[in-house]
């Protein structure tokens, strides 16, 4: 790291070190030999989240309902607004600027992890012994029916998309 002329939380201007403005405040005027750095608080709809020498505060993010967004956490003078997606939708990126509907898991696949406001549904193929016959964003793979516990026999084998079909035992078998 190259050497710096000033302390932490200071900046160099006109060959002297001035204090940075604290988070939540913007720079009005640099310090002089006789005066401190002058800072002003950000307005209600603005923020600055670091020690800074910015002359303008940043606008809080707008969570646009037309894009499926809603406020998860209201911004302060030191923090930006955090948006999340309405139910049934998730963010398209880490910055959550728009939302898309959750993916449904097709027949033969079950839900491994249910979607959240920030992550999509995670599907997994139904393993042997399990099936899913619906397209769903919630349903996990279900186990095949156990014919034996019902004193029935398998008449039709199950697949990853269908349950087994049970039927009565063949009377002619001893």
């Amino acid at each position: 790291e190259p050497p710096t002329a000033c302390r932490e939380k200071q900046y160099l201007i006109n060959s002297q070190c001035c204090s940075l403005c604290q988070p939540g405040q913007k720079l009005v005027s640099d310090c002089t030999e006789f005066t401190e750095t002058e800072c002003l608080p950000c307005s209600e709809s603005e923020f600055l989240d670091t020690w800074n020498r910015e002359t303008r505060c940043h606008q809080h993010k707008y969570c646009d309902p037309n894009l499926g967004l809603q406020v998860q956490q209201k911004g302060t003078s030191e923090t930006d607004t955090i948006c999340t997606c309405e139910e049934g939708l998730h963010c398209t990126s880490e910055s959550c600027e728009s939302c898309v509907p959750h993916r449904s898991c097709l027949p033969g696949f079950g839900v491994k992890q249910i979607a959240t406001g920030v992550s999509d549904t995670i599907c997994e193929p139904c393993p042997v012994g399990f099936f899913s016959n619906v397209s769903s964003a919630f349903e996990k793979c279900r186990p095949w029916t156990s014919c034996e516990t019902k004193d029935l026999v398998v008449q039709q084998a199950g697949t990853n998309k269908t349950d087994v079909v049970c039927g009565p035992q063949d009377r002619q078998r001893a």
Partner: antibody, heavy 126, light 107 residues
Amino acid sequence: QVQLVQSGAEVKKPGASVKVSCKASGYTFTGKYMHWVRQAPGQGLEWMGWINPDSGGTNYAQKFQGRVTMTRDTSISTAYMELNRLRSDDTAVYYCARDQPLGYCTNGVCSYFDYWGQGTLVTVSS
Amino acid sequence: DIQMTQSPSSVSASVGDRVTITCRASQGIYSWLAWYQQKPGKAPNLLIYTASTLQSGVPSRFSGSGSGTDFTLTISSLQPEDFATYYCQQANIFPLTFGGGTKVEIK
């Protein structure tokens, strides 16, 4: 009362490294920058750099960049200065020195040293 | 880097004399200057900071003045314990730099 107690004298060969410690007591260690200053025999004072014990942030004089490392252990209120690739002209007394707490410092870095360690003589000789 | 030039490099004086040491910065440093006293085998001792503020416990015969580039340390009446080397130091920006020192010797 404020005290800075440094480790003992060291004799090193050229190319070796030395690590000097500085144990602080009598004040909040994380509240004041710690600086390192050296003095070659019969010479003046030379500033090496500082460490902010609170954040661990450092700032080294260009001359020592890449050769010096300043660290701290806040659990034992101790600052360390390690100098690598020693040369004969690194023979000097090395001091740790505490920033004077100037509450009204509006500009400037305001680094004045109100407390010093007793000094550690590092001799570099083959 | 800001160069600090002290003069004289040495001065011979007697007890009771008024001694003046000057320090010049290669660029303006406002009032961000300190003066230290160092005795052989000892660490430096802060006398004055912000060019003219006397450090707690330092005798009032020591005074400092100046701003910008030119500064002065004055010992109004030299005492036996004042024979030592004196250094100025700028505290405007890093890297901190010291003057070359002024040795005050017994005449």
